[in-house]
Amino acid sequence: AVNGTSRFTCFYNSRANISCVWSQDGALQDTSCQVHAWPDRRRWNQTCELLPVSQASWACNLILGTPDSQKLTAVDIVTLRVMCREGVRWRMMAIQDFKPFENLRLMAPISLQVVHVETHRCNISWKISQASHYFERHLEFEARTLSPGHTWEEAPLMTLKQKQEWICLETLTPDTQYEFQVRVKPLQGEFTTWSPWSQPLAFRTKPAALGKDT
């Protein structure tokens, strides 16, 4: 038998993916476990194999359909169970009634690009990926810029309180290498959390013109 405290956390990406992490103190590493998803009002169900991500936690992705298909709606409730094999039988280790649109974590923004760069400013755009049409424009973004000699953790956060898929970075230093990241969060959902940070976009400001005041 598996003892210890159990934690089972899942997020819906708003389209066709539910990602889950299950943590269990004292669990056996070599036990075979799965997440089973049973929607209350759909004809399908789905299973994924939990794979170890650390000493006592496992993760898997329930792929519900093609990436941009709307597989669950605001009124769906999905019963999620962690099932582990014990000999010839399966034992239920955790269960939750999952409201997808109360537990959202979108995919990281993609297609970051420099639209225009100058000596002191840079205009950057991005796209959101696999986000439901349900959100309309009710999304917010956080962005951060990595300056030379600093870490990402030290970078101040810039908040965009609306669906604005671009930013104009100001007061930059000429001829300097920077990196930029952005993440997204819907307003909907009690347990909704920020997406992962996007892949960093590297850019360099233009050098100051010689013999000119900057």
Epitope: T73, A74, V75, F101, H133, Y134, E136, L187, Q188, E190
Partner: antibody, heavy 117, light 107 residues
Framework: EVQLVQSGAEVKKPGATVKISCKVS????????IHWVQQAPGKGLEWMGW????????EYAPGFQDRVTITADTSTDTAYMELSSLRSEDTAVYYC??????????WGQGTTVTVSS | EIVMTQSPATLSVSPGERATLSCRAS??????LHWYQQKPGQAPRLLII???QSISGIPARFSGSRSGTEFTLTISSLQSEDFAVYFC?????????FGQGTKLEIK
């Protein structure tokens, strides 16, 4: 500019069926939800249901489920709400509205339906 | 279904003063509460979403707050165009339900 333009007022006899249209413009109808809301005289708002044009699904409030049908024609960017077995208490203004599933961002001007023998 | 109770049914306030409208849910609805304004002969207009997020284009004098299952719409300094009926709506549980409305009238 987002617009939802509804069909004109209707007078119906008890037991009849009414079908109201809602022609939209200013946004991509194929990727939208259209809701329908009832407002009876001197009463509050009652949510009837929605159609999700992308998912191709409808949701109905239990109080209307047996009598209401919401449809959409994506070729003309028009949503429809049909209410059958009309009774006097169905006399109301009916609104279509665009929104996510959770709230209604833009509303039509309303269609008055009078049920009288 | 969740019952939304608005109070008072009618509120009389003088222009320039503050108005405070209340909406209580019969069970916990997190922040899934939205406010609408309706003027006579017009369709409702969305004002506030998720308890406190203002919709773009809505004047800054409109604000929302939450304490448990009680939600408040505050209009800081009433203008003549603010006298209307205000509805709250929950989207936590299906079917979504509206309050019966608070009529804000000129004192």
């Amino acid at each position: 500019e987002v617009q939802l333009v509804q069909s004109g007022a209707e007078v119906k006899k008890p037991g009849a069926t009414v079908k109201i249209s809602c022609k939209v413009s200013g946004f991509n109808f194929k990727y939208s939800l259209i809701h329908w809301v009832q407002q009876a005289p001197g009463k509050g708002l009652e949510w009837m249901g929605w159609i999700d044009n992308e998912a191709g699904e409808t949701e109905y409030a239990p109080g209307f489920q047996d009598r209401v049908t919401i449809t959409a024609d994506t070729s003309t960017d028009t949503a429809y709400m049909e209410l059958s077995s009309l009774r006097s208490e169905d006399t109301a203004v009916y609104y279509c509205a665009r929104g996510g599933p959770w709230f209604l961002s833009y509303w039509g001007q309303g269609t008055t339906v009078t049920v009288s023998s | 279904e969740i019952v939304m109770t608005q109070s008072p049914a009618t509120l009389s306030v003088s222009p320039g003063e503050r108005a405070t409208l209340s909406c209580r849910a019969s069970q916990i609805i997190s922040n899934n509460l939205h406010w609408y304004q309706q003027k006579p002969g017009q369709a409702p207009r969305l004002l506030i979403i998720y308890g406190l997020q203002s919709i773009s284009g809505i004047p800054a004098r409109f604000s929302g707050s939450r304490s448990g299952t009680e939600f408040t719409l505050t209009i800081s300094s009433l203008q003549s165009e603010d006298f209307a009926v205000y509805f709250c709506q929950q989207s936590n549980n299906f079917p979504y339900t509206f309050g019966q409305g608070t009529k804000l009238e000129i004192k």
